[in-house]
Structure formats: structure tokens, C-alpha cells
């Protein structure tokens, strides 16, 4: 039988007694920045080329004895997980290894930077097909390392990194915290977060997804036929690098943004027990376990979206938080969330020629998060329409008035500190799906987009009694672009998208009376692109 981790990432239609996905990543080159490796292990011999790059610090301790098999252990195992002929994910991928970690697994920021520069120069001198760079290492936050990763990513290279094994917020580490890098946490055979001694996988908003990372069988540097089990986010990242290699081999023109969206889209959803994570990190941590797509082609017709959380604003009265989409993505909606419920909403605004999502803290609040819904929408023309606070008691309204523009998201933000505490709910008139409605004291922002074949609809789910959470999901074939709460309820903590479901969170019901104040309505905007569907049918 195949190792559990390969079975886990394999869609059911491929599952037989063997792991034989349709394309093994043969068009892709994977660079591994790690320890030295045993390149003559039969699992990877002929698949891994050891470059002459080496930049490592001296080993600590006077009694340290260099033992080749120990020096090669980490890198050999990871090379096997990525492309090993027996227990590898992308059995067709070729690899190049750069030594940036010493025999104790330690490296330096400068060594990694020079390694990344070596790759960039190699790419310029001899351009090949798609490149994946695997960084199975984590150190303290480094602005300079993150910037180097950004430069390489913008040159068209896919970077995959380990979230880190510190049972901590991945945003505190580099390169895990670099937004352009695909950051991977580790799960076990039960789809639970990996515990490593007293520590374990990192988590939080800087993690893009999880992948198998416990008891992973792979090449051992002990001998040419030896295999060993290793655990950690490095192993998890190696799985995603392998999956990425296979996706890129099937569709070599995929951009980083498209690849990331596909990795998220094809992941197993909501299988991780979030109780393992600290309570304040649960909402921020993606509940996704990486998997191969069920088919290497035919994904092009879908409208792909993902949720991007900002850093926490901090508690000061005028604090704000900003969430940004990747350069190739469109910001289709913006929402906000505060654990205390004290916030002043959110707005979409232009920054450096691109829309960002900004959330505003309120007086006495412990801070807010901005939540961006970032989508792949080719040939899109999106703009924000704003209505200032209205005088009328019916509340503020704004709609998409331009011909061919559809509503993809609604945001509202207000200057008063305690909006709506003693006000009845404002109900949106039926039959007007293309408009956003809000409190009369609030500014309302509508995200209006024009793209070939784009159509959207509004879906609501209201609960009259108080509930800590109200959800509404888009049906099959539609993608959630916007998520908000219907105005009028004072106890809403915020709204955010989880996969294709809009979640509206409220204060603990025990603190809320069961008056009409308790009513909560979640509003989802669901979109699809007929243009993308037709394009993919023509290609097949």
C-alpha cells in the first residue's frame, strides 16, 4: 500500500494500489535550499543535481563531528518527498540543491539571500520552464529575506516555504511571513496539526495551507536504499512543492496567483481540528489540507477567490488594519472583524494604484482585522462607489450604476463610536440585488466590477434569535466574492469568508437580549463567470 501522505494528497479517482498521477512534474525544475544531500541514493539518483552553491555557518561546539549521513539527512529526505521515484509526490520533477544549512541544520539570512540570488542569476543565464523554489527553513522575521523572496516571486518563480515548527504565529518568522511565498503548515494522518515534542506546526494568517508533515517516509542518507520517517513543516512544504510542480507541468503558463488559488481551491476543507490552535488564531488559520487536483486540466473555467486577513490593527483608537491582494488578483470585497465588537467598519481604498481593504478600530476596542476577498478575474475593471452617511431614516444606499457592472461586495464604515446600539434593523428592499444598504450614519462602499461574462447574485440567511454565528454559502458553480452582515444589529463582531461560506459572528448570546437586536442576517454575494466557462470548453 502507498504511504499515508501520498494517499492523502491523491484525489479518489487516482487511488489504486499505487500512486501514479497523470503527470509527474517533468516540465518543472525544483530548487531546494537546505542541507547537503546524498545524491546517489537510489530514490533520487539522476533526479537531483547538486549545484556547487554552498554558504553555511560553522557548526557549533568543539566536540561536533561531521558525519556525512547526518549532514545530508534533512535535504535527502526532502528531495525524496518532492521527487523520489518511490515515495515522492512529483516523480517526474528534476531538482537542483543548494547548501544553505550546515550539518546541524543551521543557516544564515545572508547565506539564504545569496542562494536566492544564485537562482535568479541561473534563471537569467539559462531560462528553463517553470521554477519552484523550496525553502524548508524558518528563522526570525527578516524584512530583507522577505524582500528577496518578493523579488524572486515577481520574476515568475514559485516559492514554497515551511511555516516553522515553533507552535507559534508564522507571521513572526521568515520567509514564512513573506506574502508572495506559499507558506505551509503540517498535519498528520488524522488531519490534525502536527505536534513536535512540546512545540509543533506554526499557524495563523501567514499560513496559506497545510499538508502532510508527520511520519513522512522518505529517502534516508544512511544508505543508498535506506528510508526513514521524518516530521515537520519542511516535509509539509515539500509536498506542496511537489504538487505545485505537477500543476505547473500540466499548465506551465500558470502565474503564482493562479497557482496559489488552485492549491487553495483543491485542498480538503474544514478537516483540521481547530481546537489545537490558540483561540485567537483559529479564525485566522486556514482549515485547508493540500491535495492534487482531480484532473490536471479543466480548472480554468472557475472563478477562484481566497480570503486574506490583515495583521491585527492594535488597540489604539484610530488604529487601522490593511489587507492586500496579490498583484494579479482583484479585490472584490472587504469586511472587518473585531473580537470585542468595537469597530468602525471597513472601506476599500486605492493605494499605489491598487485597491486595498482597510478596517477601523473604535474607541475602547481591542483592535480590528481587515479581511480582503481576493479573486482571479481576467480583464476585470473594478471600482468602488461610495455613498456618504444619509439623512433619511431608511439608511444609506449605494448601487452599481455603470452599464455592465455587477456588485461583488459591500462595505460600510462609520465615524461614530457606537453605531446602531439603539436603532431598529434596516431591511434592504427586495428586488434590488445590485445595491448595498447601511446605517444612515455610515458610509457605504460598493465594489462594482465589469468582466466578460461575470454575473453575481445576493444570497441572505437571517436568524431572528441571537446566534453566535450565522452562515450563508454559495451553491455549486458559484464563488463567494462578498460577505457582510445586514445592518441594524449592534452585536455583530464582523463578517468574513471561509472558502465558499460567508460567516457573520456575533457577541456571546448570553450577553445579548433576545429582542429584535438579536436578529442577524448574513449576506453573501455569489458570482460566476460564463466567459471563463466558455473559454475552457473551447480549449478541451
Amino acid at each position: 500500500s502507498i504511504p499515508w501522505n501520498l494517499e492523502r494528497i491523491t484525489p479518489p479517482r487516482y487511488r489504486a494500489d499505487e500512486y501514479q498521477p497523470p503527470d509527474g512534474g517533468s516540465l518543472v525544475e525544483v530548487y531546494l535550499l537546505d542541507t547537503s544531500i546524498q545524491s546517489d541514493h537510489r530514490e533520487i539518483e539522476g533526479r537531483v543535481m547538486v549545484t556547487d552553491f554552498e554558504n553555511v555557518p560553522e557548526e557549533d561546539g568543539t566536540r561536533f563531528h561531521r558525519q556525512a549521513s547526518k549532514c545530508d539527512s534533512h535535504g535527502t529526505h526532502l528531495a525524496g518527498v518532492v521527487s523520489g521515484r518511490d515515495a515522492g509526490v512529483a516523480k517526474g520533477a528534476s531538482m537542483r540543491s543548494l547548501r544553505v544549512l550546515n550539518c546541524q541544520g543551521k543557516g544564515t539570512v545572508s547565506g539564504t539571500l545569496i542562494g536566492l540570488e544564485f537562482i535568479r542569476k541561473s534563471q537569467l543565464v539559462q531560462p528553463v520552464g517553470p521554477l519552484v523554489v523550496l525553502l524548508p527553513l524558518a528563522g526570525g522575521y527578516s524584512r530583507v529575506l522577505n524582500a528577496a523572496c518578493q523579488r524572486l516571486a515577481r520574476a515568475g518563480v514559485v516559492l514554497v516555504t515551511a511555516a516553522g515548527n515553533f507552535r507559534d504565529d508564522a507571521c513572526l518568522y521568515s520567509p514564512a511571513s513573506a506574502p508572495e511565498v506559499i507558506t505551509v503548515g503540517a498535519t498528520n494522518a488524522q488531519d490534525q496539526p502536527v505536534t513536535l515534542g512540546t512545540l509543533g506546526t506554526n499557524f495563523g494568517r501567514c499560513v496559506d495551507l497545510f499538508a502532510p508533515g508527520e511520519d513522512i517516509i522518505g529517502a534516508s542518507s544512511d544508505c543508498s536504499t535506506c528510508f526513514v520517517s521524518q516530521s515537520g513543516t519542511s516535509q509539509a512544504a515539500a509536498h506542496v512543492a511537489g504538487i505545485a510542480a505537477m500543476m505547473l507541468s500540466a499548465e506551465p503558463e500558470l502565474t503564482l496567483a493562479e497557482l496559489r488559488q488552485r492549491l487553495i481551491h483543491f485542498s480538503a476543507k474544514d478537516v483540521i481540528n481547530e481546537a489545537w490552535f490558540p483561540e485567537d488564531q483559529r479564525v485566522l488559520t486556514p482549515n485547508l489540507v493540500a491535495a492534487l487536483p482531480p484532473s490536471t486540466h479543466g480548472a480554468g473555467w472557475q472563478l477562484f477567490c481566497r480570503t486574506v486577513w490583515s495583521a491585527h490593527s492594535g488597540p489604539t483608537r484610530m488604529a487601522t488594519a490593511v489587507a492586500r491582494c496579490a498583484p494579479d488578483e482583484e479585490l472584490l470585497s472587504c469586511s472587518s472583524f473585531s473580537r470585542s465588537g468595537k469597530r468602525r467598519g471597513e472601506r476599500m481604498e486605492a493605494q499605489g494604484g491598487k485597491l486595498v481593504c482597510r478596517a477601523h478600530n473604535a474607541f475602547g476596542g481591542e483592535g480590528v482585522y481587515a479581511i480582503a476577498r481576493c479573486c482571479l478575474l481576467p480583464q476585470a475593471n473594478c471600482s468602488v462607489h461610495t455613498a456618504p452617511p444619509a439623512e433619511a431614516s431608511m439608511g444609506t444606499r449605494v448601487h452599481c450604476h455603470q452599464q455592465g457592472h455587477v456588485l461583488t461586495g459591500c462595505s460600510s464604515h462609520w465615524e461614530v463610536e457606537d453605531l446602531g446600539t439603539h436603532k431598529p434593523p434596516v431591511l434592504r428592499p427586495r428586488g434590488q440585488p445590485n445595491q448595498c444598504v447601511g446605517h444612515r450614519e455610515a458610509s457605504i462602499h460598493a465594489s462594482c466590477c465589469h468582466a466578460p461574462g461575470l454575473e453575481c447574485k445576493v444570497k441572505e440567511h437571517g436568524i431572528p434569535a441571537p446566534q453566535e454565528q450565522v452562515t450563508v454559502a454559495c451553491e455549486e458553480g458559484w464563488t463567494l466574492t462578498g460577505c457582510s452582515a445586514l445592518p441594524g444589529t449592534s452585536h455583530v463582531l464582523g463578517a468574513y469568508a471561509v472558502d465558499n461560506t460567508c460567516v457573520v459572528r456575533s457577541r456571546d448570546v448570553s450577553t445579548t437580549g433576545s429582542t429584535s437586536e438579536g436578529a442577524v442576517t448574513a449576506v453573501a454575494i455569489c458570482c460566476r463567470s460564463r466567459h471563463l466557462a466558455q473559454a475552457s470548453q473551447e480549449l478541451q
Epitope: 499505487e18 521515484r85 517526474g92 544512511d222 544508505c223 543508498s224
Partner: antibody
Framework: QVQLVQSGAEVKKPGESLKISCKGS????????ISWVRQMPGKGLEWMGL????????HYNPNFQGQVTISADKSISTAYLQWSSLKASDTAMYYC????????????WGQGTLVTVSS | DIVMTQSPDSLAVSLGERATINCRSS????????????LAWYQQKPGQPPKLLIY???TRESGVPDRFSGSGSGTDFTLTISSLQAEDVAVYYC?????????FGQGTKVEIK
């Protein structure tokens, strides 16, 4: 059942070429390595090299490198051992055997192919 | 290369008696990563291909009679036939399968006294 079936005995003259075969059945041929082992008359076993039919990766014993070529056709689950120019010293029984990453010992052997090289 | 040396070269034992074959490797075939010895024992009867008896130095292959047992670790290994039967007359080989090239011992011929 799992088996490796080898081609029949061969009698050749020095300088001639030869290709013998080993056909696997009853298992996933591309998941296992196939090794070739030589046994000269009245002597012990010598490992010659192996092939992984999944990607045609080969590894040779340095003593046999350049003397023989190992290949495979995964579409017909068959591995081959070939000589471009036989010598009298190539007279021997040749066995194929399989092994797996999780079981790197030879659990199944072919029945053997006797190659006789004589002028 | 790892050199495998068997002793004795031949062995004559009475039916029902114990037969012991030794095998020494020129370097350890025990690996710390999985704590396994990469050593196997094979039996070859005249006119037949070798047959796997023992792997990982001490694990008996399914279908092999329990009179066959393997022991040892690191560089020194033993194959024991606890009660020799007539059908056990054969040549026995040890093999290391950890490193290329894979190597066999020279063989030990077991006969009935």
C-alpha cells in the same frame, strides 16, 4: 501469482550480440526495481545492476559498467539485459530479481537464463 | 564496496542436528535511522534460483520453516538451521542490500554428514 519469467537458454558465438528478457506479472511492474544477478558455473552470486521501470533509472555494478546494458519496456512489463559483443567469459546463468523501496531485498526471482558463449 | 565473508565454505551436519553459518560484513549494515540491519539470507538448491529465507537479518520470509532463524547485528550475522532436514541441502548466501554495489557472501554449502 507474482512471478518473473525469463527467456530461454541461449548459445552464442564470441562477438555476437544478445538480449535476454524478464517479464513480470501479478504485481505493479513499475513500482519495483529489477536487478540482474550473474552466476558463473560453480560460482557464487554477483549483482550486475538494476533498473526502475517507472522511469528507466539504472544503476550498474562498476565491474559490469560498459559491459552490459539494462533496459525495460514498462508497457509490456519486461526488463532486458543485453550484450553488444559477447565473450566466452560471459558464459553463466543470469537471474532477474525484484525488490521494492520498502523491501529492498530480492523476494521474487526469475527461473534463470543460461547463456553459453563458445566458438 | 562492502565485502561479505561467509564461514565456513562448506558444512556437513547430521540430520536433525543444528547447522550454523556465519557472515561478516566489512562495514556495519545497521542504520540508526530505522534501527534495521540491511542483511538477507538466501537458499539455492541445485538447478534452481535462489530463494529468500531471512531479511532485516532476523525476519523470516513467509512460508519459510521456523527451523531457520537469523541473528546478529552491525557486522556479524548468523543463519541457524535448528534441526537439519534432507531438503535443506543447498548453498546459502548472505547479502547486504544497503549500499551499491549490492554484494553477496561467497556461499556456504550445507551437506548431510
Amino acid at each position: 501469482q507474482v512471478q518473473l519469467v525469463q527467456s530461454g537458454a541461449e548459445v552464442k558465438k564470441p562477438g555476437e550480440s544478445l538480449k535476454i528478457s524478464c517479464k513480470g506479472s501479478g504485481y505493479s511492474f513499475t513500482d519495483y526495481y529489477i536487478s540482474w544477478v550473474r552466476q558463473m558455473p560453480g560460482k557464487g552470486l554477483e549483482w550486475m545492476g538494476l533498473i526502475y521501470p517507472g522511469d528507466s533509472y539504472t544503476h550498474y555494478n562498476p565491474n559490469f559498467q560498459g559491459q552490459v546494458t539494462i533496459s525495460a519496456d514498462k508497457s509490456i512489463s519486461t526488463a532486458y539485459l543485453q550484450w553488444s559483443s559477447l565473450k566466452a567469459s560471459d558464459t553463466a546463468m543470469y537471474y532477474c530479481a525484484r525488490d521494492h523501496w520498502s523491501k529492498p531485498y530480492f523476494d521474487v526471482w526469475g527461473q534463470g537464463t543460461l547463456v553459453t558463449v563458445s566458438s | 564496496d562492502i565485502v561479505m565473508t561467509q564461514s565456513p565454505d562448506s558444512l556437513a551436519v547430521s540430520l536433525g542436528e543444528r547447522a550454523t553459518i556465519n557472515c561478516r560484513s566489512s562495514q556495519s549494515v545497521l542504520y540508526s535511522s530505522n534501527n534495521k540491519n540491511y542483511l538477507a539470507w538466501y537458499q539455492q538448491k541445485p538447478g534452481q534460483p535462489p530463494k529468500l529465507l531471512i531479511y532485516w537479518a532476523s525476519t523470516r520470509e513467509s512460508g519459510v520453516p521456523d527451523r531457520f532463524s537469523g541473528s546478529g547485528s552491525g557486522t556479524d550475522f548468523t543463519l541457524t538451521i535448528s534441526s537439519l532436514q534432507a531438503e535443506d541441502v543447498a548453498v546459502y548466501y548472505c547479502q547486504q542490500y544497503s549500499s551499491f554495489p549490492i554484494t553477496f557472501g561467497q556461499g556456504t554449502k550445507v551437506e548431510i554428514k
